[in-house]
Amino acid sequence: IWELKKDVYVVELDWYPDAPGEMVVLTCDTPEEDGITWTLDQSSEVLGSGKTLTIQVKEFGDAGQYTCHKGGEVLSHSLLLLHKKEDGIWSTDILKDQKEPKNKTFLRCEAKNYSGRFTCWWLTTISTDLTFSVKSSRGSSDPQGVTCGAATLSAERVRGDNKEYEYSVECQEDSACPAAEESLPIEVMVDAVHKLKYENYTSSFFIRDIIKPDPPKNLQLKPLKNSRQVEVSWEYPDTWSTPHSYFSLTFCVQVQGKSKREKKDRVFTDKTSATVICRKNASISVRAQDRYYSSSWSEWASVPCS
Amino acid sequence: RNLPVATPDPGMFPCLHHSQNLLRAVSNMLQKARQTLEFYPCTSEEIDHEDITKDKTSTVEACLPLELTKNESCLNSRETSFITNGSCLASRKTSFMMALCLSSIYEDLKMYQVEFKTMNAKLLMDPKRQIFLDQNMLAVIDELMQALNFNSETVPQKSSLEEPDFYKTKIKLCILLHAFRIRAVTIDRVMSYLNAS
């Protein structure tokens, strides 16, 4: 058993049918010595008396808010949550496996640049009685500071019969140098509590590996005289790290017909312009990627050929 | 300010082309190592990230773009001094800091070159003959060092009398390649920045 926060405790259970559970001793936070009784949740049934209460915690019916009273007055509370260990592996019931980039990916994180700011998100089908708390650091043995905000519900989607809820959090490394070479990964830890179930999820990454630039901005077409060709130009996104000559991007320019089956013409360039043939009803799209470290491509920025 | 790099003019800044070749070569070598050594811990998540140049060179600090010198988090240690007569310096007006930066890059390359050559000698003794260092990568390191053209003491190649532990050698190869790739990215960024300046 360990303390999650004041008056909230997590009991770790080896979770299998007929498991013996864990013996837990609760102590009433009071100078009083006698006349103390204990109850669980809203029930008025007295579970025991005395300054301490010993209970055998086996399943969720044994978890909840234990309260000690004296003469009708509440003295203190202890909330017991359960953390299930199923055959040596902590349960992951609360969050959905996003399966990207690999199986057992519960937390996904992205950064728009090298400033040390990043966003993480996760999915669940649970809509109520759900709380999250996020902590982060650079490295784990001698952790350096990363400050995270509160997790917020950022999207709701309907997936088949189920509603899916996306939560996200923004974090910022306290003293980040955009040019630094990372040798210790960022660790992100999410505590999830659903009713009386506790779970924790972690992700470990280097900022360089989660970079995804914003799409190029100011995408423009300039027709070339007496030609079907157009000059496409664009700019680095505002959110990208500066100076751009140091934090350079490379670009992919794509001409895509109206039909998805039409052949796509693609050009790769380090410049912020390219000359392409603009077909009728086609659109021109440009996306960006760090020129020197191949992390994710940005989403496409698009303009119609017409 | 937006200065995308076109194909470099070798006269203008000859090191840019070499640094791009270096990054390509080390990335290819790392990919090959990860595929060949699939049963070894060779991914970024599995290895310890060690920097053999730590406390010996300070490339990131010495090569920091002027725009980032206002960022206190970037100014940890900038006191390392180096020899300053490189041939990549296209202009006579090149600052002392730029010379210091290129000299630091040269020292990095020299240290990695020694490590890789020592390691290759061990890998050649492996009866499994599972993996060797790409000669192209070693050649590209050499070319960039020649382009930088700094006078520097020759570091003797390390020789080891004891029987090599091939498992440990292959894991060390992965660690070295990951670290060198990261340094090659920094070198490429620096060359691009200097080329645009």
């Epitope: 299998y16 007929d18 498991a19 199923e86 055959d87 040596g88 019931d93 199986n103 | 049963f39």
Partner: antibody
Framework: QVQLVQSGGGVVQPGRSLRLSCAAS????????MHWVRQAPGKGLEWVAF????????YYADSVKGRFTISRDNSKNTLYLQMKSLRAEDTAVYYC????????WGQGTMVTVSS | SYVLTQPPSVSGTPGQRVTISCSGG????????VKWYQQLPGTAPKLLIY???QRPSGVPDRFSGSKSGTSASLAITGVQAEDEADYYC????????????FGTGTKVTVL
Amino acid sequence: QVQLVQSGGGVVQPGRSLRLSCAASGFTFSSYGMHWVRQAPGKGLEWVAFIRYDGSNKYYADSVKGRFTISRDNSKNTLYLQMKSLRAEDTAVYYCKTHGSHDNWGQGTMVTVSS
Amino acid sequence: SYVLTQPPSVSGTPGQRVTISCSGGRSNIGYNTVKWYQQLPGTAPKLLIYGNDQRPSGVPDRFSGSKSGTSASLAITGVQAEDEADYYCQSYDRGTHPALLFGTGTKVTVL
């Protein structure tokens, strides 16, 4: 004490269907994940499928994906395996099993796919 | 499709020490715990070892398990006639959990 009693096995022709049941007692069935495991005659153990305690997630071996469906009725304390498009290579003893460090197995039920 | 490899058979005389190996990889045994089962002919498997080296109550202490890196082993010290059975190791792969990964199985013969 924990008990898992299996039923529904038998002889079936290739391409036909069969449903296996596993009745649980002696524990809170709705709190635990459940597996199906099979063993072809003279062969080793092969995992078939898993279902979470609340039925929300199901996982299948590639060899049965799209043909077998694992399900549970927590109100009846029963686990099911619906097997369709059966093949000769599905011939095996099928076991249900609880998920956890200490597990309990059903007695097994024989499924024979033969023309 | 078996990822955990066991020797097909091992044998010993009563009182001898018999060991069965189970060889896996970084993503299964290297990452998760190992169980061992005993299966007597015509019966369901019986749990002998869980959590690499833990014995459930009722399992004789002549059975012991261990794990090192990407391999595990089961030792029967002082093998007895009633130990003649098939033995299976089991683990999980970090990418496909909760799918059970079973070993190929080992037939133990008491001479």
